[in-house]
């Protein structure tokens, strides 16, 4: 199967968690942190124009 | 701003369903990115699925991909979790979220109080 996208980190991402429990075998969850589902699920909403409305916040 | 109430809850066997409800009070909900978070007991709180304001872009962690769906109503100011396939593993506190912009970063910054599932084996 192929890797799903927020699967893996990205370095400009900054903190971030491996969805894949796997991938993190040392354990480094933090409060602080975010899974790379959520980050990649907010950095997409952020960059598409149907994700979030303008003026939002 | 948005306030978040979580609904639908409860015990039920491994591989049944469960249906997450999350009602928004305000008029601004549709201008909101919508989550559904999870944690279970001893564990740190877990991304499940997401949700673009207008319900068409959806998101979803390895673990639930195929078996949990989020959708939204806008005109009811409601955000679904439709849970099939249910496994012990599943058993959290289940949260909805709303997600703001500040300065260019999204984050999830509006939590509901959270509704218990529990997956029993």
């Known amino acids: 199967l192929p890797t799903l996208p927020w699967s893996v980190c990205q370095e400009e991402w900054g903190d971030c968690l491996p969805s894949d429990p796997d991938l993190d075998p040392v354990g480094t969850i933090t409060n602080e942190t975010k899974s790379s589902a959520e980050l990649y699920f907010l950095k997409t909403v952020l960059q598409q124009k149907d994700g979030i409305e303008d003026g939002l916040g | 701003q948005v306030q978040l109430q979580e609904s639908g809850g409860g015990l039920v066997q491994a591989g049944g369903s469960l249906r997450l409800s999350c009602a928004a009070s305000?008029?601004?909900?549709?201008?909101?990115?919508m989550g559904w978070f999870r944690q279970a007991l001893g564990k740190e709180r877990e991304f499940v699925a997401g949700i673009n304001w207008s319900g068409s872009m959806t998101y979803y962690a390895d673990s639930v991909k195929g078996r949990f769906t989020i959708s939204r109503d806008n005109a009811k100011n409601m955000l679904y979790l439709q849970m099939n396939s249910l496994k012990s593993e599943d058993t959290a506190v289940y949260y909805c979220a709303g997600v703001t912009v500040v300065g260019g970063a999204p984050a999830f910054d509006y939590w509901g109080q959270g509704t218990q599932v529990t997956v029993s084996s």
């Open positions: 305000g008029r601004t909900f549709s201008r909101y990115a």
